[in-house]
């Protein structure tokens, strides 16, 4: 039984220009991360394997930078870089848990943090 | 006591086919990612590739993808390197290696490859 | 790929002698380095894993530090068991990479 949950920054949003750091936690389950992958729609950006350590996908290597943790930054933000991001836990022996969160690119200076929130 | 062997090494003519072996004990094999790691006389050590211990997933260094798959039966702890389309610069020490938190823990003793005409 | 350089290439130093291996990276890769040991006919051997953790049964005469860029191997007193070639290896960025290797000698 899957008893693990994802915990993500949510909905965020940012400024046109600047950057902003996507971040996931798994708790409450004692399963081993074997790979995290962040996807954008349906574009693999990056991957950290346990053992390996990152790939980042060749059409964002220049603004698309590992970390903190298991997180990711994306950088020089451009309003196509609004949409829905996740975060993609493959584990074992639970198998796959997927966190979402929404990044707003905005053009104004009025960008701020949106809540945390949990996705079973 | 961990302990990884390797076979299957061996003289081959370029352009030809070789498998390698490595059997693992002393470990709970379906939970490590193993790798292969080779080494040209003389010279220093290179990553080959990779397989994930449960979703079966590789990843392969730029210099053997598309010739190379690693592959691995968990019912009978063992790992494989199937080589094809070997070339002069395969020759190598194969050495299948446990990983473990970035680093690789353990090697076996590795196994000699010889691609020559 | 990240390029690992290590140096010197090779040195002679005497039983008892504190030696001191550098390696470093193209790009940070935070601590994600690795040190392995290795003799002539045998397979490497894992010494330091994440920059200065010893792994399990090394000697801790034998250390590691750094982050970032640059990384240090020493072992604090050579004993004739460390005559051998070092590695250095990171795991940040897929594929791995490893340095060319620092050959220990007896002067």
């Known amino acids: 039984m899957m008893t693990g949950t994802i915990e993500t920054t949510g909905n965020i949003s940012a400024e046109k220009g600047g950057s902003i750091i996507l971040q996931c936690h798994l708790s409450s389950t004692t399963a081993q991360v074997t790979q995290v992958n962040w996807e954008q729609q349906d574009q693999l950006l990056a991957i950290c394997n346990a053992d390996l350590g990152w790939h980042i996908s060749p059409s964002f290597k220049d603004r698309v930078a590992p970390g903190p943790g298991l997180g990711l930054t994306l950088q020089s933000l451009t309003v196509n870089d609004t949409g829905e991001y996740f975060c993609i836990y493959h584990t074992y022996p639970d198998g796959t848990y997927t966190g979402r969160i929404f990044l707003e690119v905005l053009e104004s200076s009025v960008a701020e943090h949106g809540a945390r929130f949990q996705i079973p | 006591e961990v302990q990884l062997l390797e076979s299957g090494g061996g003289l081959v003519q370029p352009g030809g086919s070789l498998r390698l072996s490595c059997a693992a004990s002393g470990f709970t094999f379906s939970n490590y990612g193993v790798s292969w790691v080779r080494q040209a006389p003389g010279k220093g050590l290179e990553w080959v590739g990779y397989i994930n211990p449960s979703r079966g997933y590789t990843y392969y260094a730029d210099s053997v993808k598309g010739r190379f798959t690693i592959s691995r039966d968990n019912s009978k702890n063992t790992l494989y390197l199937q080589m094809n389309s070997l070339r002069a610069e395969d020759t190598a020490v194969y050495y299948c290696?446990?990983?473990?938190?970035?680093?690789?823990?353990?090697w076996g003793q590795g196994t000699l490859v010889t691609v020559s005409s | 790929d990240i390029q690992m350089t290590q140096s010197p290439s090779s040195l002679s130093a005497s039983v008892g002698d504190r030696v001191t291996i550098t390696c470093g990276a193209s790009?940070?890769?935070?601590?994600?380095l690795n040190w392995y040991q290795q003799k002539p006919g045998k397979a490497p051997k894992l010494l330091i894993y994440?920059?200065?953790s010893l792994h399990t049964g090394v000697p801790s005469r034998i250390s590691g530090s750094g982050s970032g860029t640059d990384f240090t191997l020493t072992i604090s007193s050579l004993q004739p068991e460390h005559f051998a070639t070092y590695y250095c290896q990171q795991s940040y960025i897929i594929p791995p990479t490893f340095g060319q290797g620092t050959k220990v000698e007896i002067k």
């Open positions: 290696a446990r990983s473990y938190g970035g680093g690789f823990d353990y």
């Open positions: 994440d920059a200065s």
């Open positions: 790009q940070t890769i935070e601590r994600r």
